[in-house]
Structures are given as C-alpha cells and as structure tokens.
Interface confidence: low
C-alpha cells in the first residue's frame, strides 16, 4: 500500500493550563527569542478581579511553566498577588515588570522571568510607562490617589521619586522630535481645565520646563504632531462655547486649526496622523461626524468624507447599547498598513446599526472615496449579482460591528506591513453591512476582493503573508483552515481529536513565523485554558528562489498604479509558488514618480467634494465663511494673484508635470 503522506502541519505543543480565568494576555518577547509570557486574569470590567496566574514558555509555546508562586509579597505575607497587567521593556527584551492590582508592590525580572524580585513601592502602580531607549527608566502613575501622582524610577522600578501631582495624562517625548528624557504632562488646574507642560529634567528645574498650552480640555502626542482641544467661550453667541483643535507639527508652537463648518463642533478625534497629514473626525451637535484632512502642518482642514461612523462615550452614539462595551472613543476608520494613502472607512446613515452602515475606500489619502467592488463569485463559485450602479457593494466590519456582535466577535480588518497589499476582513455583500458575514480577501490593497471563507472566522497570517490560517467562529471545532495562495484555495488540518471552543488564533507580531497559536477551552461545562502550537513550515515546503517572486505595484480600483504621485514596486511571492519567504525576508521596494492626475489632488481649503461621489469634483463649500475664489485685498491693477481652482496637491504626493498639474494647481490671474 502507498505510504501515508505526512501531515504538512504539525501540532508541536498542546498545553492544558487547568486555569479558568476569563482573559489571557499574551506577549512574545521577540528578537528571535523563544520566550512567551501569558497572564491569565479576570476581565477588568468585572468587579475587583480576585486572582491571576502568570505562565512563561521558554520553547516558543510547546510548554508553559506557571510562575505565580514567584510573585509573592515576601516572608510572613500569605496574601495572593493579583496581577492586572505586566510590562515589557522596549529597550531590553529580557526585562518585564508585573504590577499588583491592589497592593503597592511590583516584581521585576532582568532574565525572562527566571528570577523575579519583589519591591514595596510608595504608590499603586496602575499605569507604568517604560522608556523606549533607556532600559532603567520608567514612569509610574497612581490614578487611585486623590492627588493623581506621577512617579519616576531610574533603576527599573526598585526605587521611586514623585515628580508631579494632579496629573491627567503623561507621556515620554518621541525620538527624534524631542530631546532624550523629555516628559509631557497634562496637569489638572483648579479651573477644571489642564495645562500641558514639557520637561527635560523630570521637573527638577524651572528653566528646563516649558508650558506648551493652557486651558486645555484634552492633549495627545502623536509622532511629529501635538494635538490639544480648548473650549472657547463665544461672546454674544447663542451657543455658549465651542471646541477648538490646536496643533503643533515638528514641535513648533501650537496654533488653532481651521475647519470649514458652520455647525457647532462638539468633539475632535484624531483618526490618523501617520503620513505627514492629519485625518480628524469632527463630531457636530447634530450627532453627525465628518472626516477632515489637513495639509502637512495640520492647521488647515478640508472636508474629506461626510457621515463617518464615530462613537464617543457621552457623545455620538452614547445613547446606544454600545455604551456598555466601549469606554473609549473610536472611529470606524482603518489605515491599510504597508502602503501609503489607502484607508477604509464606514459611513453611517441614521442610528448605529448594521442596516445603516456602508464601507468606502480611498487610494489617494482621502482625496476621493468609493464603495468597495463586491467579488464576482462566492467561495463556492456561484455568481454574485452585486452592481455598484444598483447601490450594492462590499462592506467590511470594523470596531462598531465587533461591539454589536459580542457573541461572534467580528475580527478586525487585517493589514500589515509584513504583507503589503494583502487584506483580510469580515464583511458582507449588499446595500449595507447587515447581510450574512463571510471572510473576504484582497491581494490588491482593496482594489479587488474575493470571498474566501463562508461565515465568520478567526484569521491571521505568517511567513510575511505566505500562509493564511483561519478557524470558524461560534462553534466547537478542531479544524484549522490554511491557504498558501493568498486565500484562493484552502486546505483543512485537524488540530485535535476532540473539537474545542476557540477564543483566538495568533502568531508572533511581525507575522514572520510559521508557528500559530490556538487559544481555546476543551472542558465541556467549565472553561479551562488550552493552548495549542501549530507549525505550518512544511505546508510551504522549501525556501523560495528568485523565480518564485514577481514584481507587484498597488493600484486603485481602476488599475491606476500611480498612487500619491508615485509607482511603488514590491517584490512579492507569486501566490501559486509553494515555498517560504523565511523569517529574514527583506521585501525590496522601488519607487518612481508619475505625472500628475486628478487622484493626486484633494479639495482645497474652502472646497468640498461634490455630493455625487462619482463626479470627483471639488465645489465651493457653502459652510465656508470666506470667499473661495475672491482675489486678495488689495489686488493692484496690473499685478497677478494665484486663483485656486478648488484643488490642492495631497501632502506627500510626489507627482510632477502632466496637463492636470497646470489645470488643477490654480493659475496666476490678473487682478480685476
């Protein structure tokens, strides 16, 4: 008889922890280390968590060792430590800190938890913030203390000094925009508002301390940008106050941003500030939220998209059931990672339910938005009749859908730098998001989609996108589905004899490995954690050679490969090559500039997209109080001025030349 084919996927670790906590926090130490740390705890949303357990694996998840007994309070004290969180040093991957949820006590390790030292400290360490470069340096915050104290340690948590009180928020400065050891704090003032300070010597001297902004409602540091909101009281106005956004780019002094709108503004939410431009959700008093985009400085905002889905506790959507599950504001807005300028947003038309939700995508950083083209066929090969012209398109679940479907927690959109152009999402085809959900995959950065798996699934990928794995949600199962061709076809691997209830499917961040971890429970009545490690290296066979790669350029839904004024060429494994990229795969990228087209422009300040998205024209915004086209004052006869045509080149767009540049960039015209 023919020899049995060996399974291409192997379960090389199956650990039953005999632990019934309802949450698990998992951390891979990274940097090619085999260490994984797992904290089992009760949900922080429940009344005071009573217990916790900490487990460490030194063999990449094959086995786990319980180390909770090392987390004790020393001789004579028999009370049990309750660890709510642990912290990993970004500067030294061997170091961890475990903080007790109630006692003023923490434990530190310098050697991947082989040895742990406990220290009594002078505050309750609810929040620790470890420095990204200096491994001994960290800040600690005690939010339970009436004086809201901020502490500093420069010996990795062994000794502490208090550096500020009445602290609302704090953060380390960001390299290279701030000096080393810079701290930003937002301090509560008696007025009810805050003052934002910056210090380079932990507030030891006045000369190294600087006031950034006063009378602040909220403050946030995001890379090159600083954002703050201020409440402005309008004299002689029916509306008593309005909220202003203040912005700094490159650590320049903060200035008030300008928005073109007559509607009172309740709130601002920074949706994205990662590409030298800022996307802000502006929530109005009528519970409508619009998405605005700025130029690089982040000061002049133009309307990019109306009616974006945004939730805020006490604000937009807070009269819905979502308030029970979300205590932080969020927008249904996803930046497609690994590429520039591609974003997916959810539009909302009416109350917050899936019947009123539709997805849109932009390939030019919010210059133009379009609905997602539905796949032509189902995963079974049946034709899907869904035409954009009839209001039918593909809609992808984001944060709100997750919260509205708690029993079957929808997976978020998955896009990563490890596999540029590959996107996996849970969604549905139709007029809105309320239809049956399936898993959809795009290999083209969202330009085209295919239905990959019927029904909701957990999913992730490894080997830089070379292998995708998925497990069905909402049922006991022992089937791991996997694809080595970007979701075109799938195979099934039976990972355990008995079906288990799966809570998650993960791989080490960076998605370079071919090892996947399944978290679940195999007790019929009582939940008890089960961790399975699955190695899929053999499913990919051999290392890839040059012939297994192709050159790929992202394009928009019309096939235009010039995005943000340049064509980017990535080296990408051909979907049908069964081989692995390997941990150290370095994806070469070549960039070349293009001539300018309409896609390289967005609406200028004082203009907005025409209501008919398909026209893609910018028209004067009726809410703009200035005169969009009028010449400057004065405009002497005989001189010229640049008259806008309603467009401005997208920040970071590198196109040059072409007829469109001359047509859209405004013209020098004689003064009237």
């Amino acid at each position: 008889s023919a020899a049995l084919q060996p399974e291409p996927i192997k379960v090389y670790g199956q650990v039953s922890l005999n632990d019934s906590h309802n949450q698990m926090v998992v951390h891979w130490a990274g940097e090619k280390s085999n260490v994984i740390v797992a904290l089992a705890r009760d949900s922080l949303a429940l009344a005071r968590p009573k217990s916790s357990d900490v487990y460490v694996s030194y063999d990449y998840g094959k086995s786990f060792k319980k180390i909770s007994d090392k987390l004790n309070f020393g001789l004579g004290n028999r009370s049990e430590a309750v660890i709510a969180q642990f912290y990993h040093s970004p500067a030294d991957n061997k170091r961890y800190i475990f903080a007790d949820a109630y006692a003023q006590y923490l434990w530190i390790t310098f050697d991947f938890c082989n040895t742990l030292q406990g220290f009594s400290i002078p505050f309750r360490a609810a929040d620790l913030l470890l420095h990204s470069k200096a491994s001994n340096l960290l800040l600690g915050f005690d939010r339970s203390h009436p004086n809201k104290q901020l502490w500093k340690s420069d010996d990795f948590g062994q000794t502490w000094i208090m550096i500020q009180e009445h602290v609302k928020s704090f953060s380390w400065g960001i390299d290279p925009y701030d000096k080393p050891n810079t701290i930003y704090i937002e301090r509560h003032e008696p007025s009810g508002y805050s003052t934002v300070f910056r210090s380079t010597d932990f507030f030891q001297s006045r000369e190294n301390q600087e006031v950034i902004l006063e009378e602040v409602r909220d403050f946030q540091l995001r890379d090159k940008y600083m954002f703050a909101t201020k409440v402005v009281h309008l004299l002689g106005s029916e509306q008593q106050s309005s909220v202003q956004l203040w912005v700094s780019f490159g650590r320049k002094p903060m200035r008030a941003a300008q928005f073109v709108t007559r509607h009172p503004i309740n709130e601002y939410y920074i949706a994205d500030a990662s590409e030298d431009q800022v996307f802000v959700c502006v929530s109005h008093s009528n519970n409508r939220t619009n998405l605005y985009i700025s130029e690089a400085e982040g000061l002049k905002f133009s309307l990019s998209l109306e009616n974006v889905l945004y939730y805020s506790p006490g604000g937009a959507g807070s009269d819905t059931l979502v308030r029970y599950f979300a205590n932080e504001p969020f927008a249904d807005f996803h930046r497609v990672e690994g590429l520039q300028g591609v974003y997916i947003a959810t539009l909302i038309n009416g109350s917050m339910n899936e019947e009123n939700m539709r997805s849109v995508i932009t390939f030019d950083k919010g210059g133009t938005w379009e609905f997602l083209q539905a796949p032509a066929f189902t995963g079974y090969g049946e034709k899907i009749n869904c035409e954009l012209s009839q209001g039918c398109s593909l809609h992808l679940a984001q944060r709100l859908s997750q919260l509205l479907n708690l029993q079957l927690r929808r997976m978020p959109i998955l896009s990563k730098e490890s596999a540029p152009g590959l996107i996996i999402a849970t969604g549905s085809v139709g007029k809105n998001l309320a239809s049956k959900t399936n898993v959809y995959i795009s290999s083209s950065a969202g330009a085209r989609w295919r239905e990959a798996l019927p029904g909701p699934h957990y999913y992730t990928w490894g080997d830089h996108g070379g292998i995708i794995t998925a497990i069905a949600q909402g049922m006991e199962t022992n089937e791991l589905k996997y694809s080595t061709n970007e979701g075109e076809t799938w195979k099934t691997f039976i990972f355990s004899e008995k079906p288990v209830f799966v809570y998650g499917l993960l791989t080490e961040p960076g998605e370079k490995s071919t090892v996947f971890t399944i978290f679940g429970s195999n007790k019929e009545n009582v939940h008890s954690w089960l961790i399975l490690q699955v190695n899929a290296t053999d499913a990919l066979g051999v290392p890839c050679t040059e012939n297994d790669y192709k050159l790929w350029s992202p394009s928009d839904e019309r096939g235009n490969e010039c995005l943000l004024g340049h064509k980017t060429v990535f080296k990408r494994r051909t979907p049908h090559a069964t081989c692995f990229n390997g941990e150290d795969f370095d994806r070469p990228v070549v960039v070349s500039n293009c001539s300018c087209t309409r896609e390289d422009y967005e609406c200028d300040f004082g203009f907005k997209m025409s209501e008919d998205l398909s026209l893609e024209v910018c028209v004067p915004d009726p809410e703009f109080s200035g005169k969009s086209y009028s010449p400057p004052v004065p405009c002497p006869v005989g001189s010229t001025y640049r008259r806008t045509r309603g467009y401005r080149k997208i920040s970071g767009d590198t196109c040059s030349g072409g007829d469109v540049e001359a047509r859209l960039e405004g013209e020098l015209v004689p003064c009237p």
């Epitope: 090159k224 490159g250 030298d276 400057p632 010229t640 001025y641 640049r642 920040s651 020098l668």
Partner: antibody, heavy 113, light 112 residues
Framework: QVQLQQPGAELVKPGASVKMSCKAS????????MHWVKQRPGQGLEWIGT????????SYNQKFKGKATLTVDTSSSTAYMQLSSLTSEDSAVYYC??????WGQGTSVTVSS | DIVMTQAAFSNPVTLGTSASISCRSS???????????LYWYLQRPGQSPQLLIY???NLASGVPNRFSGSESGTDFTLRISRVEAEDVGVYYC?????????FGGGTKLEIK
C-alpha cells in the same frame, strides 16, 4: 513677476531702533511666508526668522529673539522687520525672502554714532 | 541647530570646464515625506542671493541646465558642467528642513 523691494540703506545710532520694509508684488502676499536673513560684511548668511502674512504667525531664530520683530501689513503687501537696541554687531545687509526662493535687494544698516 | 559645512574656496577652474562645490550637513536632511530639503544659492558680487537648486536637484526657474545637484547621505554636491564668466560668485548651501534654517559658510568660485 515676483518682486521684493527694500530700501537701499539706513544709518542709525547705537541704542536706537530701525524698522525696514519689504514690499512684495507679483504674487499673492498672504500665500507665502516671508523670511529675513542677515549678512555681515564679507560674511555668510544667517536666518533671522519668518512670518506667515495670512495670520502674522512668527517664528524666530533663538539668537534674534528680542532683537528682531517681524510684522506685516497685508493691505499694502509689505513685510517689516524692526531691530532694537542696535550695536555695531547689527551693522549688516538684511534681506527679505519670499519662501526662500525670491529675494529682495537687501537693506544695508550701518550703526554708527 | 543643523550645521552646514562648506570649503571657503573652490579649486580654480578654467572657463568652459566643469566645477563642483561640496557641502556637508550635520544631520540627514531627508523628511519623512521623501523630500530632502537642501537648497543651493549663488550670490554674485554686489547682488542678493539667487536660488539655483531646490530640494537637492531641482533647477529653479531661469537657471541654465549647466547646473545640477546630487546627494550622498549628508554630503551634497553642486556641479557646473561648463563654467561661464557669469558663474563667478559665492555659492551657499542651506537646509530648510528644520528651524532655524542654516546656511553653509559659502564657497567662492575662482576662475584661473
């Protein structure tokens, strides 16, 4: 075409102040930042600061804070720089420059008693 | 502050031959938007500075294409392919990446 007109020379006494002008034409004054640059005799160029004519937002080189004050008058498309408490170290040619691509001819300031 | 370094004098060149002028910055001038903010100016005797090249290699309007610019990390070079008498003057490099903007000390082009 873009032009930046500056007066040729100013003679001032030590300790006094001087306010020099830079009249812009040929472009929309409020659309481009106006920079000021100092050049001492036989020396290189030194950036003093800049002003955004659309909202009078200024940014100074730390070295010139307290020494230079930048202002604009959008009605006449003119930028101004005032130098205070003048000493012989302030004797130099001062250029205005629109967005660092078009330059005025410079104003020569001589501080002498 | 970013320091820009230039040699005070160029090697003397003959009219019609090529010349190059170097400049070094104390910091990378590449912005995350992919643009390197290095500019070249020429100051002819008795005149104000004139922009020659912006963003390393782009010719300003009206500048003859005898001029070109290139970079290698933090080292920048201005090349003149066929030197003419009107090219005499002091050449300054400048960084416009960070405030305060800073200039090199200037390189005087000398003709044999």
């Amino acid at each position: 075409q873009v032009q930046l007109q500056q007066p040729g020379a100013e003679l001032v006494k030590p300790g006094a102040s001087v306010k020099m002008s830079c009249k812009a034409s040929g472009y929309t004054f409020t659309s481009y930042w106006m920079h000021w640059v100092k050049q001492r005799p036989g020396q290189g160029l030194e950036w003093i600061g800049t002003i955004d004519p659309s909202d009078s937002y200024t940014s100074y080189n730390q070295k010139f804070k307290g020494k230079a004050t930048l202002t604009v008058d959008t009605s006449s498309s003119t930028a101004y720089m005032q130098l205070s408490s003048l000493t012989s170290e302030d004797s130099a040619v001062y250029y205005c420059s629109s967005s660092m691509d078009y330059w005025g001819q410079g104003t020569s300031v001589t501080v002498s008693s | 502050d970013i320091v820009m370094t230039q040699a005070a004098f160029s090697n003397p060149v003959t009219l019609g031959t090529s010349a190059s002028i170097s400049c070094r910055s104390s910091k990378n001038l590449l912005h995350s938007n992919g643009i390197t903010y290095l500019y070249w100016y020429l100051q002819r005797p008795g005149q104000s500075p004139q922009l020659l090249i912006y963003r390393v290699s782009n010719l300003a309007s009206g500048v003859p294409n005898r001029f070109s610019g290139s970079e290698s990390g933090t080292d920048f070079t201005l090349r003149i392919s066929r030197v003419e008498a009107e090219d005499v003057g002091v050449y300054y490099c400048a960084q416009l990446l960070e405030l305060p903007y800073t200039f090199g000390g200037g390189t005087k082009l000398e003709i044999k």
